[in-house]
């Protein structure tokens, strides 16, 4: 039975040209995390494999940095980066947990972080 929950940075906003950290945290389970995938829509941005470390998709190498921790840093943001991001935790023996983050990239300098929220 899957008992874990994923806490994410929730709905967030950032300025065009700036950077943002996408963070998820898996709690309430003793399952072993084998890999975390970061996806935007259906595109894979990065993989953090427990054994092998980080893989950044070649098309995002210039603008995506691994970490901190299992999180992901997006740099040189553009308005096109607005949208949904997913952290997908592959765990043993529970299976897969998915967290969702919505990022809005703003033209102005009034970007504010949204509240944290949980996805069971």
């Amino acid at each position: 039975m899957m008992t874990g929950t994923i806490e994410t940075t929730g709905n967030i906003s950032a300025e065009k040209g700036g950077s943002i950290i996408l963070q998820c945290h898996l709690s309430s389970t003793t399952a072993q995390v084998t890999q975390v995938n970061w996806e935007q829509q259906d595109q894979l941005l990065a993989i953090c494999n427990a054994d092998l470390g980080w893989h950044i998709s070649p098309s995002f190498k210039d603008r995506v940095a691994p970490g901190p921790g299992l999180g992901l840093t997006l740099q040189s943001l553009t308005v096109n980066d607005t949208g949904e991001y997913f952290c997908i935790y592959h765990t043993y023996p529970d299976g897969t947990y998915t967290g969702r983050i919505f990022l809005e990239v703003l033209e102005s300098s009034v970007a504010e972080h949204g509240a944290r929220f949980q996805i069971p």
Epitope: T34, Q35, N37, E39, D42, Q43, L44, I47, N49, D51, L52, G53, H55, P58, H90, T96
Partner: antibody, heavy 122, light 107 residues
């Protein structure tokens, strides 16, 4: 040219260990992950594990956990795969295979060794 | 572990035929799917990586498509040297499992 040359055929008794080598040449050894894949007679391909020659990090298929050890010698650009507690079902051709993309793993394996036949028989 | 199911397990075709081999993953693997060709007594050869990218030196009659869980390898016009066994492999999540193979034989 890019090449992987493996050690010669081995005949082992059940319970013994075997260590297969794979010497790389023609590219930057530290930049490419190395996979090990085996193929039993008349059967399909079976992924065993992978090693990062740069840091020595490894990931093994659960099936081989505790029996397989992958190592590397950076001075000779050689990776090794040791399989212990051999049984007859381990009779197979063992291949080393280089990851296609530098410093990463998800894009297949573009260069393969010639294969090493390991026969386990009493 | 992710299970990879190939179909058919074997097929008979003639030179010039269009051949399609399918591979299904037990869960989404995005586009992290590779195709290999193997001839008897030889090491496998990479044909397609990342579901649809043609490996350097591979003839353009080979093509790959699909994403998520369903993938296809197509040989547009089968040549005599294409009679071999073909394997799919997912490389998203360790262990990087292979499909059972599809043997393409001469009709």
């Amino acid at each position: 040219q890019v090449q992987l040359v493996q050690s010669g055929a081995e005949v082992k008794k059940p319970g013994a260990s075997v260590k297969v080598s794979c010497k790389a040449s023609g590219y930057t050894f530290l930049s490419y992950y190395m996979n090990w894949v085996r193929q039993a007679p008349g059967q399909g391909l079976e992924w065993m594990g992978i090693i990062d020659p740069s840091g020595g990090r490894t990931s093994y298929a659960q099936k081989f956990q505790g029996r397989v050890t992958m190592t590397r010698d950076t001075s000779t650009s050689t990776v090794y795969m040791e399989l212990s507690s051999l049984r007859s079902e381990d009779t197979a051709v063992y291949y080393c295979a280089r990851a296609r993309y530098p410093s990463s793993w998800p894009y297949g394996t573009d260069v393969w060794g010639q294969g090493t036949t390991v026969t386990v028989s009493s | 572990d992710i299970q990879m199911t190939q179909s058919p397990s074997s097929l008979s075709a003639s030179v010039g035929d269009r051949v399609t081999i399918t591979c299904r993953a037990s869960q989404s693997i995005n586009s992290y799917l590779n195709w290999y060709q193997q001839k008897p007594g030889k090491a496998p050869k990479l044909l397609i990586y990342a579901a649809s990218s043609l490996q350097s030196g591979v003839p353009s009659r080979f093509s790959g498509s699909g994403s998520g869980t369903d993938f296809t390898l197509t040989i547009s016009s089968l040549q005599p040297e294409d009679f071999a066994t073909y394997y799919c492999q997912q490389s998203l999540l360790t262990p990087f499992t292979f499909g059972g193979g599809t043997k393409v034989e001469i009709k």
